[in-house]
């Protein structure tokens, strides 16, 4: 959480999650009766997200602060974080109930369990998260975040297992970025692209944060990138003053987040 | 500058099949959905389908389901139309025509036809 | 299917003529698009969400209309508006044309 060119940055809020995403009208925004926001989702081979849907998604952190169609006329929208301009300071699903008048205008909730998505957040001890469509060639105008958050004291072993993004000088077109942190505002270690491994990472904290970020043009082969949880106890997580050993690189330690 | 640009004419036999393309250029070819439309001689349009190309997802009108499978390839920017068991009243030009993703849709741009003539 | 019946199917106008043909839906749709297709060519997108002009179309053209009834209008007929024009709805599965109004010189 923060600022970022002068705009309250929360890179929590996913676009996509669980098979769920949000569409509204090529107009703008609360312009899709319920029969509409039905034809958008099947028209994109979805169909209108469930109550249980919406709030699986929500879990995982999908956050959009506009009301839309649900199956059964219900209509909602999902709060990961409150805010005091959407939500009414409240989390959950903002939930404006089964409507009566199906000729209201909203936006619209679909389902798509084939959709491909990528990013969450992820709370199990080892993963490997992979670029859209891996081992095929990512898409373009991909944005996804993977956003790790272990117990506190623990911390995180990053490793890039393979890596082949456009490479460009200042890895402009493709990249993937890391954060020591919880958002991409704080703590910056690196913009990767390219085709070689960068070293392995390993946190300050219990949190951790990829980006990855594909252009309008060429594409790759993609990447997979692992990581391990570090004990309070082992070895490594006693060495996290130091710049780079071997093949690691431990970053200083600056904060934790429970 | 946004160009669709359509193979061949096509002469087949009734009860072969035929591949149609068609190639996309000056935009982003997995931004926008692709069309396919058909005309009989001297006839009106009537609509086919279309192909998400970012997902592959694609769907037909029900009067082609089992006539026209749609296909597209990122890598060379192509959408393509099979058609298959082809009879006499497949002759006709087929137009591929590009549409945003945002509902409603619309054609903003059109290829220049592919003439198929079905003949024994 | 939303049926589109385009009426009239073929008429005629004079130069400077004003000209009004209309597209009535079975389903209601938020918005009617046009396209002018001319002898031999590609169609072209003509008029898009009921009322606004694609890149290049003459400003003697004017859409219209809401729910189940469309129109489109010339102001003034000229020769190079010779064409077939076909109304669109992209709002239902499946998507559907009009039979078209053939427009020709008087």
């Known amino acids: 959480w923060g600022f970022k060119n002068g705009i309250f940055h929360n890179s929590i809020w996913l676009e996509q999650a669980a098979g769920v995403y949000h569409r509204e009208a090529r107009a703008g925004r609360y312009k899709l009766t319920y029969a509409e926001a039905k034809a958008v989702c099947e028209f994109e081979g979805g169909r209108l997200a469930t109550y249980k849907q919406l709030e699986a998604a929500r879990k995982i952190g999908f956050h959009v602060c506009a009301a839309g169609w649900m199956a059964k006329g219900r209509v909602g929208y999902p709060i990961v974080k409150p805010g005091p301009n959407c939500g009414f300071g409240k989390t959950g699903i903002i939930d404006y109930g089964i409507r009566l008048n199906r000729s209201e205008r909203w936006d619209a909730y679909c389902y798509n369990p084939h959709a491909k998505e990528c990013g969450g957040v992820f709370t199990d001890p080892k993963r490997i998260f992979k670029s859209p469509g891996f081992p095929n060639e990512y898409d373009d105008n991909q944005v996804c975040y993977w956003h790790i958050r272990l117990k506190y004291g623990q911390r995180i072993h990053l490793s890039f297992l393979d890596f082949d993004l456009e490479h460009d000088p200042g890895c402009l077109a493709d990249y993937v970025e890391i954060y020591d942190s919880y958002d991409d505002v704080h703590g910056f270690v690196g913009r990767y692209c390219g085709d070689e491994l960068p070293e392995d990472i390993i946190s300050t904290g219990n949190v951790m944060t990829l980006k990855f970020l594909s252009d309008a043009s060429v594409t790759a082969g993609g990447f997979q990138i692992k990581y391990v949880t570090v004990d309070p106890a082992s070895k490594s997580s006693q060495a996290k003053n130091t710049s780079t050993t071997g093949n690691k690189k431990f970053l200083p330690g600056r904060f934790s987040h429970l | 500058q946004v160009q669709l640009q359509q193979s061949g004419a096509e002469l087949a036999k009734p009860g072969a099949s035929v591949r149609l393309s068609c190639q996309a250029s000056?935009?982003?070819?997995?931004?926008?959905?692709m069309h396919w439309v058909k005309q009989r001689p001297r006839q009106g349009l009537e609509w086919i389908g279309y192909?998400?190309?970012?997902?592959?997802?694609?769907k037909c009108h029900q009067k082609f389901k089992d006539k026209a499978t749609l296909t597209a390839d990122k890598s060379s920017n192509t959408a393509s139309m099979q058609l298959s068991s082809l009879t006499y009243e497949d002759s006709a030009v087929y137009y591929c025509?590009?549409?945003?993703?945002?509902?409603?849709?619309?054609?903003?741009?059109w290829g220049q036809g592919t003439t198929l003539t079905v003949s024994s | 299917e939303n049926v589109l019946t385009q009426s009239p199917a073929i008429m005629s106008a004079s130069p400077g003529e004003k000209v009004t043909m209309t597209c009535s839906a079975t389903?209601?749709?938020?918005?009617m698009h046009w396209y002018q297709q001319k002898s031999s060519t590609s169609p072209k997108l003509w008029i898009y969400?009921?009322?606004k002009l694609a890149s290049g179309v003459p400003g003697r053209f004017s859409g219209s209309g809401s729910g189940n009834s469309y129109s489109l209008t010339i102001s003034s007929m000229e020769a190079e508006d010779v064409a077939t024009y076909y109304c669109?709805?992209?709002?239902?599965?499946?998507?559907?044309f009009g039979a078209g109004t053939k427009l020709e010189l008087k």
């Open positions: 025509a590009r549409s945003t993703s945002g509902y409603p849709y619309y054609f903003d741009y």
């Open positions: 000056g935009y982003t070819f997995t931004t926008y959905w």
């Open positions: 192909i998400i190309p970012s997902s592959g997802y694609s």
């Open positions: 389903s209601s749709v938020s918005y």
């Open positions: 969400d009921t009322s």
């Open positions: 669109f709805q992209g709002s239902w599965y499946p998507l559907t």
